[in-house]
């Protein structure tokens, strides 16, 4: 049935970059300016995305593909296809609804985005603090007394960071 219908449907012959114009006896017409069709057989063309505000154009719209946006410096992309721009903060800060705020004591953020995370608790691994943490950096855990035997490694790397994200306010 599908094959029979497609043979009878003149619109199925319209390639990407065109639309099947009902007003002109289903002739394949080129997409108007600022519109596109990424697949064949479409009866309308889609309006091109406009990269406004701090969105900037990463890829121009063409007759067969939509524009792509990214965010201007000071902001970063969020969402599928960069559907939103979110402001950057400095290292040692996290973004809240009140803007960028310094990490509380005992937490750090070494990126321009994401949340402040607690310093690694060295004592949970039976280790001591070799280098104190800051707002921008995790603590560095040093050897436990048992590790001080010859040939033992003197520093363990900090625990792997969680994927940054925002916690609810």
């Amino acid at each position: 049935f599908e094959r029979t219908r497609s043979l009878q449907d003149p619109c199925s012959n319209c390639p990407a970059g065109t639309f099947c114009d009902n007003n002109r006896n289903q002739i394949c017409s080129p997409c108007p300016p600022n519109s596109f069709s990424s697949a064949g057989g479409q009866r309308t063309c889609d309006i091109c995305r406009q990269c406004k505000g701090v969105f900037r154009t990463r890829k121009e719209c063409s007759s067969t593909s939509n524009a792509e946006c990214d965010c201007t410096p000071g902001f970063h992309c969020l969402g599928a296809g960069c559907s939103m721009c979110e402001q950057d903060c400095k290292q040692g800060q996290e973004l809240t609804k009140k803007g960028c705020k310094d990490c509380c004591f005992g937490t750090f953020n070494d990126q321009k985005r994401g949340i402040c995370r607690p310093w690694t608790n060295c004592s949970l691994d039976g280790k001591s603090v070799l280098v104190n943490g800051t707002k921008e950096r995790d603590v560095v855990c040093g050897p436990s007394p048992a590790d001080l035997s010859p040939g033992a490694s003197s520093v363990t790397p900090p625990a792997p960071a969680r994927e940054p994200g925002h916690s609810p306010q």
Epitope: L78, S83, L95, P168
Partner: nanobody, 123 residues
Framework: EVQLVESGGGLVQPGGSLRLSCAAS????????MNWVRQAPGKEAEWVAN????????YYVDSVQGRHTISRDNAKNSLFLEMNSLRVEDTALYYC????????????????WGQGTTVTVSS
């Protein structure tokens, strides 16, 4: 079509005042957090202020706190930024931006932007 249109920018002397407006259309304005963001020539874009859907919460970047006031009129689908005691460093292109779905809970991303209105503070 979802749209934001800013107006009210202009040339003003230091110490002067301006009121920026943003007309929203194509979406339920009263349901969204709204923001003002600015970009000075040659500098990174900077968030300026935001306001929650009913206007009861307002927050500002430190550099404008006490000088600028964000407000909204949900009946008229409008956002405002009252700018007082203007400084040369307030010179920028000012954008109105809608907080995306989940703003304030899941993220602080902005999904709809206007074209901006230019504020120039110069003697």
């Amino acid at each position: 079509e979802v749209q934001l249109v800013e107006s009210g920018g202009g040339l003003v002397q230091p110490g002067g005042s301006l009121r920026l407006s943003c007309a929203a259309s194509g979406f339920t304005f009263r349901s969204y957090w709204m923001n003002w963001v600015r970009q000075a020539p040659g500098k990174e874009a900077e968030w300026v202020a935001n306001i929650n859907p009913d206007g009861s919460e307002k927050y500002y970047v430190d550099s404008v706190q006490g000088r600028h006031t964000i407000s909204r009129d949900n009946a008229k689908n409008s956002l405002f930024l009252e700018m007082n005691s203007l400084r040369v460093e307030d010179t920028a292109l000012y954008y109105c931006a809608r907080g995306g779905p989940g703003y304030g809970d899941l993220h602080y991303g902005m999904d709809v932007w206007g074209q901006g209105t230019t504020v120039t503070v110069s003697s």
